[in-house]
């Protein structure tokens, strides 16, 4: 089970919202907190270790997932072309 904790939110830039979130999860052995279908979930620890973020299935159904350069995060591209970027820190 997981819960989202929002750390802060920056809406100062028009048409762009930057939010810092983390998830608290109780995961079984070999799993770790991650994101599946845009919600916090327990995922295979190997995915985090290898930074193959798209293997978490972090985007909604119908969206395309792509890794950012240096595997620093991922983008979810909606069918209409809108892109949501998530960076991992």
């Amino acid at each position: 089970t997981c819960e989202i904790v929002t750390l802060d939110r920056d809406s100062s830039q028009p048409r762009r919202t930057i939010a810092r979130q983390t998830a608290r999860c109780a995961c079984r052995k070999g799993q770790i907190a991650g994101t599946t279908r845009a919600r916090p979930a327990c995922v295979d620890a190997r995915i985090i270790k290898t930074k193959q973020w798209c293997d978490m299935l972090p985007c909604l159904e119908g969206e395309g997932c792509d890794l950012l350069i240096n595997r620093s995060g991922w983008t979810c591209t909606q069918p209409g072309g809108r892109i949501k970027t998530t960076t991992v820190s």
Epitope: T1, R28, T36, R37, R39, A41, C42, R46, I47, T50, Q52, C54, D55, L57, C59, E61, G62, E63, G64, C65
Partner: antibody, heavy 120, light 107 residues
Amino acid sequence: QVQLQESGPGLVKPSETLSLTCTVSGGSISSYYWSWIRQPPGKGLEWIGYIYPSGSTNYNPSLKSRVTISVDTSKNQFSLNLKSVTAVDTAVYYCARVNPFGYYYAMDVWGQGTTVTVSS
Amino acid sequence: DIQMTQSPSSLSASVGDRITISCRASQSISTSLNWYQQTPGKAPRLLIYGASTLQSGVPSRFSGGGSGTDFSLTITSLQPEDFATYYCQESASIPRTFGQGTKLDIK
């Protein structure tokens, strides 16, 4: 509506490699995990393995030394290779989509299955 | 590996009956359990995931319950199309394992 179709030879000789392909239509292969399952005649279901969008895999340890699952996102296909087959590998082979329902991973779309017989 | 054991292995019932199939895991899997239905010559069909959530399109006469190591699938008021083989499957570990199946036939 997502549909899966298995294809490949129905007859394989002992010691050879069984090769099957699953073609995904009506949806993107990169949005899910994908799986192979088999069912020997008159018996139950056996999970063979998963493949992730990146091409990473999880295999059943009982088959790990002989099995390879790969993905071709450009063709919306994923494949199964099982080497050094014997008669015990005779089965109906199914491909399936693995859907993450929240935290619960379940195979919610299946191909119709293809029968593979291992015989000389 | 986690072992999944179903009981009974076979079951005879009549249209309109209520039946329950049990599935036991060799170690705790929380609610990471799925149920499938398979009719002869067809691919399995997902009925229930997460131990108790009905898959879209599945009739409400099907229900699932349990957590930890003990689970059940109940069908109330059996219909002719329900006579099939049912499998439980855990989704908590690798390898994913299925129960051996329960064959439900007409009495």
